[in-house]
């Protein structure tokens, strides 16, 4: 018996609260695919590598994504 159905997304719960960018190890945006029908935003925290799922529809999360991408574009040559 498989652990779950064929569809397998990573996120169990989603948060509307943005994380502190300083606590972030990495931020992944996983597009919808045959394995998971929805976009998933996964924040991996520096402490213990804890993974937090963020709500892609949340205004605060959209702002966080903008801030992180702005920060990245500043760093890249």
């Amino acid at each position: 018996v498989p652990l779950s159905r064929t569809v397998r997304c990573t996120c169990i719960s989603i948060s509307n609260q943005p994380v502190n960018p300083r606590s972030l190890e990495k931020l992944e945006i996983i597009p919808a695919s045959q394995f998971c029908p929805r976009v998933e935003i996964i924040a991996t925290m520096k402490k213990k590598g804890e993974k937090r799922c963020l709500n892609p529809e949340s205004k605060a999360i959209k702002n966080l994504l903008k801030a992180v991408s702005k920060e990245r574009s500043k760093r890249s040559p």
């Epitope: 652990l3 779950s4 159905r5 569809v7 397998r8 997304c9 996120c11 169990i12 719960s13 989603i14 948060s15 509307n16 998971c36 029908p37 929805r38 213990k48 590598g49 804890e50 993974k51 937090r52 709500n55």
Partner: antibody
């Protein structure tokens, strides 16, 4: 005040089925995974099953895999546990639990007793 | 987890939970009184939910997580469970529970 109100327990014969329900209130149900945890009489807590916030992923303990099915209806703020092919060892108080960040189960239902006996 | 622990009133109780590389995972602790649902007392190793008294504290290092209850009181006996999330199997693992008796 977060509330999880359970129903559906009772006495059932081995091999039969039973469905537990848990109605949630005072939080955005559609953003949270939900768990079922059980406790056999005089024993410790045992995790049973988990469903993701939108119902796309389900996870089960080995002891119930293939017999139990967890589902949810976000329009009714309700999570279900369909228990089939019940055995005497499934006799327990079943708790519905709201998922939380980093191993945090902050809200539990009142529990419902399931007795499997002939 | 040790199945039981007895302390005298006012003493400090240390309840231990052991597991391989436990320090790499977050541990939470639950108090259960007879006939009641479990109650979260510590999460993310050391954090206390609102409403939980400061005499409850937690730590996690090496292969051991500890729940410390200072100034124990002669209240109804409780059982304490540790719990962690196993990312590899996507399942929750509970300790066997420690019954605390304040004599």
């Amino acid at each position: 005040q977060v509330q999880l109100v359970q129903s559906g327990g009772g006495v059932v014969q081995p091999g039969r089925s039973l469905r537990l329900s848990c109605v949630a209130s005072a939080f955005t149900f559609s953003r949270y995974g939900m768990h079922w945890v059980r406790q056999a009489p005089g024993k410790g807590l045992e995790w049973v099953a988990l469903i993701s916030y939108d119902g796309s992923s389900e996870y089960y303990a080995d002891s119930v895999k293939g017999r139990f099915n967890i589902s949810r209806d976000n329009s009714k703020n309700t999570v279900y546990l369909q228990m089939n092919s019940l055995r005497a060892e499934d006799t327990a108080v079943y708790y519905c639990v709201k998922d939380g960040l980093a191993a945090k189960l902050g809200h539990w239902g009142q529990g419902t007793l399931v007795t499997v006996s002939s | 987890q040790a199945p039981s622990l007895s302390v005298s009133p006012g003493q400090t109780a240390n309840i231990i939970c052991s597991g391989d590389n436990l320090r790499t995972k977050y541990v939470s602790w639950y108090q259960q009184k007879p006939g009641q649902s479990p109650l979260l007392v510590i999460y993310q190793d050391t954090r206390r939910p609102s409403g939980i008294p400061a005499r409850f504290s937690g730590s996690n290092s090496g292969n051991t997580a500890t729940l410390t209850i200072s100034g124990t009181q002669t209240e109804r006996e409780s059982t304490y469970y540790c719990m962690t999330w196993d990312v590899d199997t996507t399942s929750m693992i509970f300790g066997g529970g420690t019954k605390l008796t304040v004599l």
